[in-house]
């Protein structure tokens, strides 16, 4: 997260980290006791999922292995359209005050809505500095028309843009798959942005979760 600050303790109990061994790979969100939602470009063969602590490496955190993941069938490595994936935990997460399910959206929030993006990704770019504590930054939703003015052909349907004019505030490497939460519901998953991160007037681009609630529910049902 660029130009952010540590999240208020316990304010993001649905936030998870996907680790490769002990190394941060991506962010994600807990949908229920068995399922984590993240970005399709985060796919690996096996995951270790960190839950229940804002601090990576915290011994009190739950760590659960996951071996099965299901990318959206329309995901494209070239355009990053449909950049979402469900990861099935090998064992159930234990819900608590620090481990809660995210609220999936019942509607798409409009441009101008203030939202929070969070993650353990690098706080500097291009040189990397990975924090141990979960970082947050507030950004505003940007209309597809305004975002297309910046990204032109790179922007596809079901991509959601967010940022602050003339500001560096944005997600970065390591935040991928993590949540963009607006008015208490999950509206976006960190998908992509320009590199180096934090270019003023280059919005962050997110998978627009409100367009995929049916796929999320159908996929979890299908692979129960």
């Amino acid at each position: 997260i660029i130009d952010g600050a540590p999240c208020a303790r316990g304010s993001h109990p649905w936030q998870v980290a996907l680790l490769s061994g002990n190394q941060l790979h991506c962010g994600g969100v807990l949908v229920n006791e068995r399922w984590v939602l993240t970005a399709a470009h985060c796919k690996m063969n096996e995951y270790t999922v960190h839950l229940g602590s804002d601090t990576l490496g915290d011994r009190r955190a739950q760590r659960i292995k996951a071996s099965k993941s299901f990318r959206h069938p329309g995901y494209s490595t070239q355009t990053h359209v449909n950049d979402l994936m469900l990861v099935k935990l090998n064992s159930q997460a234990r819900l608590s005050s620090m481990v809660k399910k995210v609220r999936l959206p019942s509607r798409c929030e409009p441009p101008g809505t203030t939202c929070t993006v969070s993650g353990w990704g690098t706080t500097t770019s291009p040189d990397v500095t990975f924090p141990s504590d979960l970082m947050c930054v507030d950004v505003k939703l940007i209309s597809p028309q305004d975002c297309t003015k910046v990204y032109k052909d790179l922007l596809e349907n079901s991509m959601l843009c967010a940022g602050i004019p003339d500001s560096k505030k944005n997600a970065c490497n390591g935040d991928s798959g993590g949540p963009l939460v607006c008015r208490g519901t999950l509206q976006g998953l960190v998908s992509w942005g320009t590199f180096p991160c934090g270019q003023p007037n280059d919005p962050g681009v997110y998978t627009q979760v409100c367009k995929f609630t049916k796929w999320i529910n159908d996929t979890m049902k299908k692979h129960r």
């Epitope: 990204y151 032109k152 052909d153 970065c172 320009t194 180096p196």
Partner: antibody, heavy 122, light 107 residues
Framework: QVQLQESGPGLVKPSQTLSLTCTVS??????????WHWIRQHPGKGLEWIGY???????YYNPSLKSRVTISVDTSKNQFSLKLSSVTAADTAVYYC??????????????WGQGTLVTVSS | DIQMTQSPSSLSASVGDRVTITCQAS??????LNWYQQKPGKAPKLLIY???NLETGVPSRFSGSGSGTDFTFTISSLQPEDIATYYC?????????FGGGTKVEIK
């Protein structure tokens, strides 16, 4: 189809400044997510990255050349330029301009100019 | 800077042969590794991006694999038009750096 075309003198005297321009057609230099690079190749050798410029004017140069390099952009002309000062014979090379799709998830050079040979000699 | 070590520096193979080139990064670059083909007097051309993704319009006999520090580029069945020099390039970190190249010739 994006096309890039380098232009500038093919012969530069030692200690002078090498100046090249890259003209972009078929795409806007102001498009977000695309960075505009200079890369060179010494005769019979490999590729050396020089630096880039973004639509905002943000630049990044190879530390090995940083003290001598300036890259600038003219969005109104859809052009970007390279200046390399205090040249020596070691700067004799084919100079390429290139576009990179440069995202957090994916970054690569997708379009290149055909290259222009610059010889440094008195 | 991240050093990219490419091997072999040159190879000679027959038409139809399987050709493999390796590239090793001096530190972890995840999958930010691209492969380019350069024919004499021409600019490099992108073949593979992000370690394993085939660029649009590139024949399927070209493939790439690997992650972290070790990467492989393969031509499954060498064709006469594949005579060229091949370069790997890391895009994980600035400055971007290239391997030394592998010159592929026909026996």
């Amino acid at each position: 189809q994006v096309q890039l075309q380098e232009s500038g003198p093919g012969l530069v005297k030692p200690s002078q400044t090498l100046s090249l321009t890259c003209t972009v057609s078929g795409g806007s230099i102001s498009s977000g997510g695309y960075y505009w690079h200079w890369i060179r190749q010494h005769p019979g050798k490999g590729l050396e990255w020089i630096g880039y410029i973004y639509r905002s004017g943000y630049t990044y140069y190879n530390p090995s050349l940083k003290s001598r390099v300036t890259i600038s952009v003219d969005t109104s002309k859809n052009q970007f330029s390279l200046k390399l000062s205090s040249v020596t014979a070691a700067d004799t090379a084919v100079y390429y301009c290139a576009r990179a799709k440069q995202l957090t998830t994916s970054r690569y050079f997708d379009y290149w100019g055909q290259g222009t040979l610059v010889t440094v000699s008195s | 800077d991240i050093q990219m070590t490419q091997s072999p520096s040159s190879l000679s193979a027959s038409v139809g042969d399987r050709v493999t080139i390796t590239c090793q990064a001096s530190q972890d670059i995840a999958n930010y590794l691209n492969w380019y083909q350069q024919k004499p007097g021409k600019a490099p051309k992108l073949l593979i991006y992000d370690a394993s993704n085939l660029e649009t319009g590139v024949p399927s006999r070209f493939s790439g694999s690997g992650s972290g520090t070790d990467f492989t580029f393969t031509i499954s069945s060498l064709q006469p038009e594949d005579i060229a020099t091949y370069y790997c390039q890391q895009a994980s970190d600035l400055p971007f750096t290239f391997g030394g190249g592998t010159k592929v010739e026909i026996k």
